[in-house]
Interface confidence: low
C-alpha cells in the first residue's frame, strides 16, 4: 500500500507522458489522477515505466474501479496486463475480440499463464460458447489451446467452430479429447465430397469408431501410417485384413515397420495368419490356421 502524500507543487500530471518516468512511486501516487490515467491508458504502453511504477498505476486503477475495470481500460492495458492477478481478471467482463487479441499480444511468445487462462475463460463464458472467431484467435496465439481443454470443456465447442481447427492444433490432444471432437468434425464436414472430407477429417480420426473406419475403407482414401497409428486400438481391432488394406492403399507396406507397436501389434494378434499372409509383408503373430476364434467382446458382454 502506497502512503498518501500531497503532490509537490508543479508536479500534478496534466497528461500521461514520458516525464512521468522520472517520478518516484509516491509522486506517481500523489500526482497522477486515476481518471486521467483511465482515459489515457493507451499511452502507458509507449512509456518505459519500471515494474514498480506499473504497480502504482495498477493500484490507482484498482482504487478507481474496485468492482473491475471497464473494457475501455482493459483494451489498452498493454504490459500492465502482466501485473494483473487471476483474481483481478475474474472481475472483468470482456466481450470484444479486439480486447482479447490486444491482451494476448502482450503475452505472445510465452506459454499460457494463469492470467491468460482466466482471461480466456472470462471471454468464452461471456460469449456462451467457443465460437469460430474466438477459436481462430486462440489457436493462432496458442496452437495447443484446444488440447489444453478437458473433454468436458470440449463438449461445449459447437461443430461450426471445428472449421477453424488446423491439424497442428490437435497435435497434443489425447484419445479422450479426440473422442469428443471427432463427432463434431463429422457433423461439420458432412456435406463435403469424399476426398475433401477425408483431408478435413483426417486429423480427428483418433476419435473415430470402427464403423466409420470401415466406411472410409470403401472410399479409396489411402490413409497414411502416421494417421493409422493414432487410431483408437478398440476401433482398429475389428477391422478385417481386407478393410485395412483398402484403408491404407499403397501405405499398407508400412505395417511391417510398425508391427511391434499399437494398434498394429494388437490388430495382428486378432487376424488369421493366412489372411495376414495375403498382404505379402511377412507379418507374424496371427491366429494359426485351424484354431477356433472366440469373440471375447461378446463373451464379456454376456458374463
Amino acid at each position: 500500500e502506497v502512503e498518501k502524500t500531497a503532490c509537490p507543487s508543479g508536479k500534478k500530471a496534466r497528461e500521461i507522458d514520458e516525464s512521468l518516468i522520472f517520478y518516484k512511486k509516491w509522486e506517481l501516487e500523489a500526482c497522477v489522477d486515476a481518471a486521467l490515467l483511465a482515459t489515457q491508458m493507451d499511452r502507458v504502453n509507449a512509456i518505459p515505466f519500471t515494474y514498480e511504477q506499473l504497480d502504482v498505476l495498477k493500484h490507482k486503477l484498482d482504487e478507481l474501479y474496485p468492482q473491475g475495470y471497464p473494457e475501455s481500460v482493459i483494451q489498452h492495458l498493454g504490459y500492465l496486463f502482466l501485473k494483473m492477478s487471476p483474481e483481478d481478471i475474474r472481475k472483468w467482463n470482456v466481450t470484444s475480440l479486439e480486447t482479447l487479441k490486444a491482451l494476448l499480444e502482450v503475452n505472445k511468445g510465452h506459454e499460457m499463464s494463469p492470467q491468460v487462462a482466466t482471461l480466456i475463460d472470462r471471454f468464452v463464458k461471456g460469449r456462451g460458447q467457443l465460437d469460430k472467431d474466438t477459436l481462430d484467435t486462440l489457436t493462432a496465439f496458442y496452437p495447443g489451446y484446444l488440447c489444453s481443454l478437458s473433454p468436458e470443456e470440449l463438449s461445449s465447442v459447437p461443430p461450426s467452430s471445428i472449421w477453424a481447427v488446423r491439424p497442428q492444433d490437435l497435435d497434443t490432444c489425447d484419445p479422450r479429447q479426440l473422442d469428443v471432437l471427432y463427432p463434431k468434425a463429422r457433423l461439420a464436414f458432412q456435406n463435403m465430397n469424399g476426398s475433401e472430407y477425408f483431408v478435413k477429417i483426417q486429423s480427428f480420426l483418433g476419435g473415430a469408431p470402427t464403423e466409420d473406419l470401415k466406411a472410409l475403407s470403401q472410399q479409396n482414401v489411402s490413409m497414411d501410417l502416421a494417421t493409422f497409428m493414432k487410431l483408437r486400438t478398440d476401433a482398429v481391432l475389428p477391422l478385417t485384413v481386407a478393410e485395412v488394406q483398402k484403408l491404407l492403399g499403397p501405405h499398407v507396406e508400412g505395417l511391417k515397420a510398425e508391427e511391434r507397436h499399437r494398434p498394429v501389434r494388437d490388430w495382428i494378434l486378432r487376424q488369421r495368419q493366412d489372411d495376414l499372409d495375403t498382404l505379402g509383408l511377412g507379418l507374424q503373430g496371427g491366429i494359426p490356421n485351424g484354431y477356433l476364434v472366440l469373440d471375447l467382446s461378446m463373451q464379456e458382454a454376456l458374463s
Epitope: 482466466t118 456462451g128 489425447d174
Partner: antibody
C-alpha cells in the same frame, strides 16, 4: 456473503425417497454449474453428479452408483438446487454437500455445510 | 473412469515440518487437479486448483505441482491449523473423482 445451505436430510428406509434442497445466495446462481458431493461416515469424498447452467445447456451428469436413481434439477428463479433420491440403499448413507463448479476448471470452490441422509431399516 | 491414488493415507508430523502428499491419476489429466483440506465436521475447502494455482485467501505455505499423472501438495512449514485430511480431485472428465484422502496428524 456467498453461501450455500442444504436442507431435507433425515432418516429414510431402504427403497424410500428423499429430496434435498440447496439454497444459494451471494453469487449469480444461474451462471453456476452446481454439483452434489457426498461423504459416507468416516469415508472419503465422492462426486454424485452435476447440472450445468442453462446457458451451457442445463445438462446433467451422474456417478455410476446413483445413475437412474438420483435426479439433479435447478430452479434459477428461486436460486435453488435439488437432489431427488429414489430407491435409496443403505450405502447411500452420507453427508450430502452442495457445491459450485468453476466452469473452466471444474473445481468446487463454494460448499454448503452439508446435510446428513441416513438410510436404515 | 479415472482413478486417483493418494499416498500416504496418513502421516504424523510436527509443527514446522515440511509435508508432502502425492496423488497419482490412472491416466493423464494434464493440469486438471485440485487439492482440498477438510477438518472434522466441516465442509472441504479448496486450497489449490489447476495443479499449482493457489486459491485466494489460502496461505502461501501451501503449494501444488505436477502435470500429467503425478501431482504433489506441499506444506512448507506445518502450522497447528493444518492438521486435517487432504484430498486430491481430478477435474479432467466426468465422473469427477477424488483421491482416498491423506490424514495429517500431530506427532
Amino acid at each position: 456473503e456467498v453461501q450455500l445451505v442444504e436442507s431435507g436430510g433425515g432418516l429414510v428406509k431402504p427403497g424410500g425417497s428423499l429430496r434435498l434442497s440447496c439454497a444459494a445466495s451471494g453469487f449469480t446462481f444461474s451462471n453456476a454449474w452446481m454439483s452434489w458431493v457426498r461423504q459416507a461416515p468416516g469415508k472419503g469424498l465422492e462426486w454424485v453428479g452435476r447440472i450445468k447452467s442453462k446457458t451451457d445447456g442445463g445438462t446433467t451428469d451422474y456417478a455410476a452408483p446413483v445413475k437412474g436413481r438420483f435426479t439433479i434439477s435447478r430452479d434459477d428463479s428461486k436460486n435453488t438446487l435439488y437432489l431427488q433420491m429414489n430407491s435409496l440403499k443403505t450405502e447411500d448413507t452420507a453427508v450430502y454437500y452442495c457445491t459450485t463448479d468453476l466452469p473452466k476448471l471444474r473445481n468446487f470452490h463454494i460448499w454448503g455445510q452439508g446435510t446428513l441422509v441416513t438410510v436404515s431399516s | 473412469d479415472i482413478q486417483m491414488t493418494q499416498s500416504p493415507s496418513s502421516l504424523s508430523a510436527s509443527v514446522g515440518d515440511r509435508v508432502t502428499i502425492t496423488c497419482r491419476a490412472s491416466q493423464s489429466i494434464s493440469s486438471y487437479l485440485n487439492w482440498y483440506q477438510q477438518k472434522p465436521g466441516k465442509a472441504p475447502k479448496l486450497l489449490i486448483y489447476a495443479a499449482s494455482s493457489l486459491q485466494s485467501g489460502v496461505p502461501s505455505r501451501f503449494s501444488g505441482s505436477g502435470s500429467g499423472t503425478d501431482f504433489t501438495l506441499t506444506i512448507s512449514s506445518l502450522q497447528p491449523e493444518d492438521f486435517a485430511t487432504y484430498y486430491c480431485q481430478q477435474s479432467y472428465s466426468t465422473p469427477l473423482t477424488f483421491g482416498g484422502g491423506t490424514k495429517v496428524e500431530i506427532k
